[in-house]
Interface confidence: low
């Protein structure tokens, strides 16, 4: 049996392809015949599903041309947060020691997360759910579990979050040390394994694998919301907006932003992934009577999609005595 292929590397030139290149094994132990290339889609980090990206005015924004994202504090038009019940806008709640510690850890995580997106060769994930250790090339890497505050995370089970083992796909590569893997999902992480096989492969099998993690590039338009935005009137001067989610987004959708207003679209509402998954849309509350327009934009791991076409809706004035006392 030959030794493992050397120097496996991968790069992406499109949202659906990964190019893989390697060097022959140092010990072919006979005539090298072919290589087996196997690839497997990797689940997203559970943290990305559970974190509420609308909390504490943090929104991921596209910051770098290479598609890495950061989470920034928003100072203009901050989204109001409810302090102790639904009593309308109020000042920011004082931070507890636990929250301060969580923010410190959040900053650490952001650095790791930025690196995670920046490197085409994957750095081990900062958090694992069901595995405390991960064997990487005979090295055990343990990872510290992160403490997060309840305000930042959800316990809602996202069907996509369950760390399913995606199937491996396989192809045979003859007489060369490079290949192109196609039909992949955009901005998605894959594990690619390469096995060396010599003339005795059928009898003795092939080598153990050398592997690499690589991410496909983001796809243009993949984060755009398909189809129309619709609305339904609700009691108490509110309406419910519904929209379909992008079918094959860049990685996953972290949040949605609604821009709405009666004269100009000067109000903003952030809708977390978890809220959207629960309700299929979002409720806009405490609207003054009148005609409104709204647009919606999704934010994925790689940045923002396009704003939707405007949806027009109206809030009726209450009539009669009821209107008089208001």
């Amino acid at each position: 049996v030959p030794s493992i292929p050397l120097d496996v590397l991968s790069a992406s030139n499109s949202s659906s392809q990964l190019i893989v290149k390697w060097n022959p094994p140092s010990l072919p132990n006979g005539n090298l015949s072919y290589y087996i290339v196997r690839w497997q889609r990797q689940p997203q980090d559970g943290y990305l599903y559970r974190h509420n990206y609308c909390s504490k005015d943090k929104i991921p924004i596209r910051k770098y041309a290479d598609g890495t994202i950061d989470i920034e504090e928003v100072t203009e038009n901050p989204k109001t947060e409810v302090c102790g019940g639904e009593k309308g806008p109020c000042c920011a709640c004082p931070k507890t020691e636990a929250e301060k510690q969580a923010e410190k850890e959040e900053a650490e995580y952001r650095k790791v997360f930025e690196n995670f997106l920046h490197n085409s060769i994957f750095v081990p994930r900062p958090e694992r759910k069901r595995r405390d250790v991960m064997q990487v090339a005979n090295t055990t890497m343990s990872s510290r579990s992160r403490n997060t505050t309840a305000a930042d995370t959800y316990n809602i089970t996202d069907p996509e979050e369950l760390e399913t083992e995606y199937p491996f796909f396989e192809s045979r590569v003859d007489n060369k040390e490079r290949t192109v893997i196609s039909n992949l999902r955009p901005f998605t992480l894959y594990r690619i394994d390469i096995h060396s096989c010599n003339h005795e492969a059928e009898k003795l099998g092939c080598s153990a694998s050398n592997f690499v993690f690589a991410r496909t590039m983001p796809a243009e338009g993949a984060d755009d919301i398909p189809g129309p935005v619709t609305w339904e009137p609700r009691p108490e001067n509110s309406i419910f907006l519904k929209w379909p989610e992008p079918e094959n987004p860049n990685g996953l959708i972290l949040m949605y932003e609604i821009k709405y207003g009666s004269q100009v679209e000067d109000q903003r509402e952030c809708v977390s992934r978890q809220e959207y998954r629960k309700y299929g849309g979002a409720k806009l509350n405490r609207l003054n009577p009148g005609n409104y327009t709204a647009r919606i934009q999704a934010t994925s791991l790689s940045g923002n999609g396009s704003w939707t076409d405007p949806v027009f809706f109206y809030v009726q004035a209450k009539t009669g005595y009821e209107n008089f006392i208001h």
């Epitope: 050397l6 120097d7 590397l9 991968s10 790069a11 030139n13 190019i19 290149k21 060097n23 085409s120 060769i121 192809s171 045979r172 590569v173 003859d174 007489n175 060369k176 040390e177 490079r178 290949t179 192109v180 196609s182």
Partner: antibody, heavy 118, light 112 residues
Framework: EVQLVESGPGLVKPSGTLSLTCAVS?????????WSWVRQPPGKGLEWIGE???????NYNPSLKSRVTISVDKSKNQFSLKLSSVTAADTAVYYC???????????WGQGTTVTVSS | DVVMTQSPLSLPVTPGEPASISCRSS???????????LDWYLQKPGQSPQLLIY???NRASGVPDRFSGSGSGTDFTLKISRVEAEDVGVYYC?????????FGQGTKVEIK
């Protein structure tokens, strides 16, 4: 934007060793690329000399393999070419290039002329 | 080793007219994944080579769409739909299927 700059002596004596360095700026030599050397004798075509990955793995042109050494210095973000036992036939413009995997050699240095003469 | 052969070696062109360069490899550059491991480069007078086409038919970043690559297996063609004065120089094909990487001998394109 990645840029490559070749440097080294422009004149080498026959039977001596040609030594060139390619400085990588605007990017890391440890990124997922191979780094190549290509040469072009006066009035002739391009000839691939060899390539190196940041781990130190190399591939060489068999026609030059016995005389060529390509090395990498990650701390200086550069890679180097050494060609021993040179003759007048090694007189050429030497280019370093980034071999962006199968996307081709998408970044090239400006080239440096090396003359082998006594 | 793979040997690359280009023709013609010299190509006088008229601005605004199309031009075509042929490249032949001594063995197939078509991999079982369906991609042809062939690149095209242009070296303008006094300059370093620049990448035009990779994987047989994919235009590199910033390359005008008047350049196109086609072909499969052992026979490849670079076409310029309408030659412009800035397109003069030497065009090289290169096989990237296996090491040693190998260039064709070059085709010199000049204005008539």
């Amino acid at each position: 934007e990645v840029q490559l700059v070749e440097s080294g002596p422009g004149l080498v004596k026959p039977s001596g060793t040609l030594s060139l360095t390619c400085a990588v700026s605007g990017g890391s030599i440890s990124s997922s690329n191979w780094w190549s050397w290509v040469r072009q004798p006066p009035g002739k075509g391009l000839e691939w000399i060899g390539e190196i990955y940041h781990s130190g793995s190399t591939n060489y042109n068999p026609s030059l393999k016995s005389r060529v050494t390509i090395s990498v210095d990650k701390s200086k973000n550069q890679f180097s070419l050494k060609l021993s036992s040179v003759t007048a036939a090694d007189t050429a413009v030497y280019y370093c290039a980034r071999d962006y995997d199968i996307f081709g050699m998408d970044v090239w240095g400006q080239g440096t002329t090396v003359t082998v003469s006594s | 080793d793979v040997v690359m052969t280009q023709s013609p070696l010299s190509l006088p062109v008229t601005p605004g007219e199309p031009a075509s360069i042929s490249c032949r490899s001594s063995q197939s550059l078509l991999h079982s994944n369906g991609y042809n491991y062939l690149d095209w480069y242009l070296q303008k007078p006094g300059q370093s080579p620049q990448l035009l086409i990779y994987l047989g038919s994919n235009r590199a970043s910033g390359v005008p769409d008047r350049f196109s690559g086609s072909g499969s297996g052992t026979d490849f063609t670079l076409k310029i739909s309408r030659v412009e004065a800035e397109d003069v120089g030497v065009y090289y094909c290169m096989q990237a299927l296996q090491t040693p990487l190998a260039f064709g001998q070059g085709t010199k394109v000049e204005i008539k």
